[in-house]
C-alpha cells in the first residue's frame, strides 16, 4: 500500500512530460490575484517644511490577476536531470475585485527625487539635481494614478538629467513583456527529494547582492516543494521579490477544501536583528539607517535595485522595531492580515494555497543641497504600497486531488 | 602633491572660439569637480561653471550659458573649456580650480590669459 | 543669485596689528564661505572653507567666524606678506559668488 502510493508519487510529482506535477507548474491551474494597498500621504507639506510624522492612510485593495502565464523556454537537461526556464510578468486589472479605478490619485514620496538624492551623494551633484528638481517643479511627495505607480510614469525632474538615466520610473517597472529568471532547478528524475530546488538562477548559484550565506539561492521558489514534507522541516525558498532567500516554519494543521494541508509561516525570527538572530548578520549592510544593525524588520535591498534605497518589509511594519515605524502615523500590523503564509499538502509537497504578503518602501534623508529635502531632520523609511499575493487550489482541482492522492492514502 | 598645469596664453580674433585646458596630476581626477573663474580689473573674480568628471555633470553661471562649455577627459585627467563667439569683453585670466563640496580646496591652476584682439 | 557685499573695498593697517574683512550674503549661504588671498600676478590662494575651517599651511593667524549671512576674516596680528587683494565666495547654491575683493596695503 504505502510503498505504492509512495512509487506513484515519486513518479507523479517529476517535473517532466506526462506528470500532474509538470502540467500544473508549467501553467499554473490555480488563479493567482495580487491585491495592493497605496499608502496615501495626508500630511506632505508638515513633513517637508517641519520634518513631522508622516500620516499615511491605506487605500486598497486594487486587485490583478498575475501569474497566469506559462513558463517559458523550458529546457530539459537530461545530463545534471534540471529543467531551465523563464517566469513571464503580466498583471491584468481586476475592477471588480477593486475599491477604485488604476486612474485613482495617491500622494506618495517622490521616487525620483529620493533615489538620486541617495544613489548620488556628491553635494556638487546634489547641487545640479536641485537646479533640475526646482526647474520641472518637482517636490519631496508627488501626486500619481495607480497605473503610473506601479507601472511606470516619466518623470519631469529625470527628463532633465543631462547625462544617461532611465526617465521611467515606477515600483514595478518594467513588469508586463519582461520574464523572471532564468530558474535551473531540479527534475527530480534521479533524486526526489531535489525536486524543484533551484539550482541556479540567471546562471548563479549566488545573488552578489548579500555577503556570505546570505548570498546563497536557497529552497524552491515556493510553489512546491520535495514530497512527504515534515512538520519539524524548515521550508527554504527563494524569492527573486526580496531579492533573497528565506525560510518557513510549520504553525498548524488545517483543512483545505477537505485536503489536509500544513500551514508553514515566516516566522518572526527570519527578520530580527543580527542581535537576536545572529545568522542575519549578513543581511545587514550599512550601520547608520540600522542604527548599528539592531533595527529589525526592513530589508535594505538597494544593492538589487541599481542603488535606489528601496527597503522591503512586512506590511505595516509588522515584526519591525519600534524606531522603524515611529515617523509614520496611520499603521496598524497584525499577523493575521499581514504575515506570510503557505499552505502544503504534504505527501506531493505541493503548496495548495498561500498568502505572500510584503511592503515595499523608500528610504528619503535630509539634504542640505536639495532644497525640497533641506528641513527635514531625520531619515525615513517611506511606506509605499504593501501587496497580498494569494492563490488558492480551486474546488475542481481539490476534487480531483482529493480522489487522487489524500483519498487513496486514507 | 596635487597641480593644475593649465594651457599657455592665447591671442584671438573677435568671434573665433578658443579651447583652454587644465591638466590634473597628483590627486584622483574624478574625485573632485573642476570649476573654471573669470578675473579682469572691471568685474573682480567671476565662477563660471563646474564639472564633475566623474559623471560629465556640470553647472554654469547663466551669464556663461552659450559662451562657454566644460568638458573633462577622464583617460588624461584634462578639463576643458571651450569660450566661443569672442569679444572684448572675454579678455581676462581664466583659473581652473578644484573643489570638493563642502569644503572648497586649495589647488588653483596658474591661469590662461585670453587676449581677443583684431 | 547671491550678492556677495565686501567691506571695506581698501584699508590700511600697520604691523601687527588686528585686520578683520567681512562679507555679506544676500541670503543665508549656510556657512559655505571661503576667503582667498591673492597677490599681484598670481593665481588666488584658499586660506579659509566653510567659514571658518583653516587650509592646512595656512598660518594660524588667520581665521574665520559667522554664520547665516554675515562672515569676517580675522588676522590677529598683521605681517608683511599678508598684504594683498582678499576675497569671500558662496558656494551655497549656484552660481557660486565672489565678493568685490579688499584690497589690504600696510600703512
Known amino acids: 500500500g504505502d510503498l505504492l502510493i509512495q512509487k506513484t508519487i515519486k513518479k507523479q510529482v517529476v517535473l517532466e512530460e506526462g506528470t500532474i506535477a509538470f502540467k500544473n507548474w508549467v501553467k499554473t491551474g490555480t488563479e493567482v490575484y495580487r491585491q495592493f494597498w497605496i499608502f496615501d500621504v495626508q500630511n506632505p507639506q508638515e513633513v517637508m517644511m517641519n520634518s513631522s510624522n508622516i500620516q499615511v492612510k491605506q487605500r486598497g485593495p486594487y486587485t490583478y490577476r498575475v501569474r497566469f502565464l506559462a513558463k517559458e523556454n523550458v529546457t530539459q537537461d537530461a545530463e545534471d536531470n534540471t529543467v531551465s526556464f523563464l517566469q513571464p510578468n503580466g498583471a491584468i486589472f481586476e475592477p471588480s475585485l477593486s475599491v477604485g479605478t488604476e486612474a485613482d490619485n495617491f500622494t506618495v514620496l517622490n521616487l525620483a527625487v529620493a533615489a538620486a538624492s541617495h544613489i548620488y551623494q556628491n553635494q556638487f551633484v546634489q547641487m545640479i539635481l536641485n537646479s533640475l528638481i526646482n526647474k520641472s517643479k518637482s517636490s519631496m511627495f508627488q501626486v500619481r494614478t495607480l497605473r503610473e505607480l506601479l507601472w511606470g510614469y516619466r518623470d519631469p525632474f529625470l527628463s532633465l538629467v543631462p547625462y544617461p538615466v532611465t526617465t521611467t520610473v515606477g515600483l514595478f517597472y518594467p513588469y508586463n513583456n519582461t520574464a523572471d529568471g532564468v530558474y535551473k532547478v531540479f527534475n527530480g528524475k534521479d533524486n526526489i527529494s531535489k525536486v524543484a530546488i533551484i539550482d541556479t538562477y540567471k546562471g548563479k548559484r549566488n545573488l552578489s547582492y548579500w555577503e556570505s550565506h546570505c548570498d546563497m539561492i536557497n529552497g524552491t521558489d515556493a510553489a512546491s516543494f520535495p514530497p512527504f514534507v515534515e512538520k519539524s522541516q524548515v521550508l527554504q525558498f527563494f524569492s527573486s521579490d526580496i531579492c533573497r532567500s528565506i525560510y518557513a516554519v510549520f504553525e498548524s494543521d488545517v483543512n483545505l477544501k477537505g485536503i489536509p494541508v500544513y500551514r508553514f509561516v515566516l516566522p518572526s525570527k527570519a527578520f530580527a536583528s543580527p542581535v537576536e538572530n545572529p545568522d542575519n548578520y549578513c543581511f545587514c549592510t550599512e550601520k547608520i539607517i540600522s542604527k548599528n544593525c539592531t533595527s529589525y524588520g526592513v530589508l535594505d535591498i538597494s544593492k538589487c535595485k541599481e542603488g535606489r534605497p528601496v527597503y522591503i518589509s512586512l506590511p505595516h511594519f509588522l515584526y519591525a522595531s519600534p524606531d522603524v515605524s515611529e515617523p509614520i502615523d496611520g499603521l496598524n500590523p497584525n499577523e493575521e492580515e499581514h504575515r506570510t503564509y503557505l499552505d502544503i499538502e504534504p505527501i506531493t509537497g505541493f503548496t495548495l494555497q498561500f498568502a505572500k504578503r510584503l511592503q515595499v518602501n523608500l528610504l528619503v534623508k535630509p539634504s542640505e543641497k536639495i532644497q525640497v529635502l533641506k528641513n527635514l531632520k531625520r531619515n525615513y523609511i517611506v511606506p509605499i504600497l504593501w501587496l497580498n499575493e494569494t492563490g488558492t487550489i480551486g474546488d475542481e482541482k481539490a476534487n480531483m486531488f482529493r480522489s487522487q492522492v489524500t483519498g487513496k492514502i486514507n | 602633491q596635487a597641480q593644475l598645469q593649465q594651457s599657455g596664453a592665447e591671442l584671438v580674433r573677435p568671434g573665433a572660439s578658443v579651447t583652454l585646458s587644465c591638466k590634473a596630476s597628483g590627486y584622483t581626477f574624478t574625485d573632485y569637480e573642476m570649476n573654471w573663474v573669470k578675473q579682469t580689473p572691471v568685474h573682480g573674480l567671476e565662477w563660471i561653471g563646474a564639472i564633475d568628471p566623474e559623471i560629465g555633470g556640470s553647472a554654469y553661471n547663466q551669464k556663461f550659458k552659450g559662451k562657454a562649455t566644460l568638458t573633462a577627459d577622464k583617460s588624461s585627467s584634462t578639463a576643458y573649456m571651450e569660450l566661443r563667439s569672442l569679444t572684448s569683453e572675454d579678455s581676462a585670466v581664466y583659473y581652473c580650480?578644484?573643489?570638493?563640496?563642502?569644503?572648497?580646496?586649495?589647488?588653483w591652476g596658474q591661469g590662461t590669459l585670453v587676449t581677443v584682439s583684431a | 543669485e547671491i550678492k556677495m557685499t565686501q567691506s571695506p573695498s581698501a584699508m590700511y593697517a600697520s604691523l601687527g596689528e588686528r585686520v578683520t574683512i567681512t562679507c555679506k550674503a544676500s541670503?543665508?549661504?549656510?556657512?559655505?564661505l571661503s576667503w582667498f588671498q591673492q597677490k599681484p600676478g598670481k593665481s588666488p590662494k584658499t586660506l579659509i572653507y566653510r567659514a571658518n575651517r583653516l587650509v592646512d599651511g595656512v598660518p594660524s593667524r588667520f581665521s574665520g567666524s559667522g554664520s547665516g549671512q554675515d562672515y569676517s576674516l580675522t588676522i590677529s596680528s598683521l605681517e608683511f606678506e599678508d598684504m594683498g587683494i582678499y576675497y569671500c565666495l558662496q558656494y551655497e547654491e549656484f552660481p557660486y559668488t565672489f565678493g568685490g575683493g579688499t584690497k589690504l596695503e600696510i600703512k
Open positions: 541670503q543665508d549661504i549656510n556657512s559655505y
Open positions: 580650480t578644484r573643489s570638493k563640496l563642502p569644503a572648497w580646496f586649495p589647488y
